[in-house]
């Protein structure tokens, strides 16, 4: 999905933002949009957002899905609206996990999100949807 070469004056895209790094916003602007899914203590954590600088998302977007984390990236206004990241499965897609509020950890590094807040706290997820 992404060009191999860094782009200096790359266009900024509007992206759907869902999850902890979004605060009260439902969108963000960046050079790439993403949709991600990871597992935390048996529960799914979904997030959507943007990489504000191309290089920040380059490695994350190239990482193949693992049993514990998947990230899908795209370029285009609102391109992540209908993307739901899925973990790889072997045959039967058991098991899934529930999207409840969690007390710990994250799925994409703070550097990837340009220093936006990433720690998942009970209070954060009580007040915000966390996909």
């Amino acid at each position: 999905v992404e060009d191999e070469k860094p782009k200096v004056n790359q266009k900024l895209y509007m992206c759907v933002c869902e999850g902890l790094s979004c605060g009260n916003e439902d969108h963000c602007e960046g050079q790439q949009c993403f949709s991600s899914l990871s597992i935390n203590d048996g529960f799914h954590v979904y997030q959507k957002g943007c990489f504000q600088v191309y290089e920040q998302g380059k490695m994350t977007c190239k990482t193949p899905p693992s049993p514990g984390q998947a990230v899908e990236c795209c370029q285009g206004d609102w391109c992540n609206r209908n993307i739901t990241a899925q973990l790889p499965t072997k045959g039967k897609s058991f098991p899934g996990t529930q999207n409840f509020h969690l007390e710990e950890q994250k799925l994409i590094s703070e550097e990837d999100l340009g220093g936006e807040q990433k720690l998942i706290s009970e209070e954060d997820l009580h007040h915000h949807h966390h996909h």
Epitope: F43, T84, P95, G96, Q98, N99, F100, H129
Partner: antibody, heavy 116, light 108 residues
Framework: EVQLVESGGGLVQPGGSLRLSCAAS????????MSWVRQAPGKGLEWVSA????????YYADSVKGRFTISRDNSKNTLYLQMKSLRVEDTAVYYC?????????WGQGTLVTVSS | DIQMTQSPSSLSASVGDRVTITCRAS??????LNWYQQKPGKAPKLLIY???SLQSGVPSRFSGSGSGTDFTLTISSLQPEDFATYYC??????????FGQGTRLEIK
Amino acid sequence: EVQLVESGGGLVQPGGSLRLSCAASGFTFSTYAMSWVRQAPGKGLEWVSAISGSGGSTYYADSVKGRFTISRDNSKNTLYLQMKSLRVEDTAVYYCANSPSWFDPWGQGTLVTVSS
Amino acid sequence: DIQMTQSPSSLSASVGDRVTITCRASQSISSYLNWYQQKPGKAPKLLIYAASSLQSGVPSRFSGSGSGTDFTLTISSLQPEDFATYYCQQSYSTPPITFGQGTRLEIK
């Protein structure tokens, strides 16, 4: 084969207690969150409670909060639901399920009847 | 709490028919919507997760679509074993996790 088997249901008087169990096999139990979902006779599905893989986080529907306690013993691959102060409206088939963004798989269910 | 409303509540159809069941959320739930089939005396069975992903082992005549607040479950050509009750379930928000009230699919 992935399997969930509930037990512990039965007839109990209002105000009484019961403990349901759900024995899991065929997967690494401790890795996954689990839930209880119930279905009153002739009615729809109602989520009751959930617990994280480690057991460190628990969640309840408002209708059972303070009366029901979910727990798990990962060494025994077993999920529990302790039910106290039971009410007639708690009468239902109780299912345990691997707790996804979707629920899958489900156990066969155990019937709890609260009646005087 | 997010409310899920299914329509119709009951539906009569014949073998071979194309059937559509709808589910509406009281607020946007992105694509975090799942569908189940339940037959009398049996546990529910997952059909579709994340709005449109077909669960392994489920026949391809079942499909799901939608995003935001409006979702559909479609059975392209109804088979005798498809007569059952169908439920939608949202997994967008923190608890409570909520189900639709169910749609009973009966033989015409």
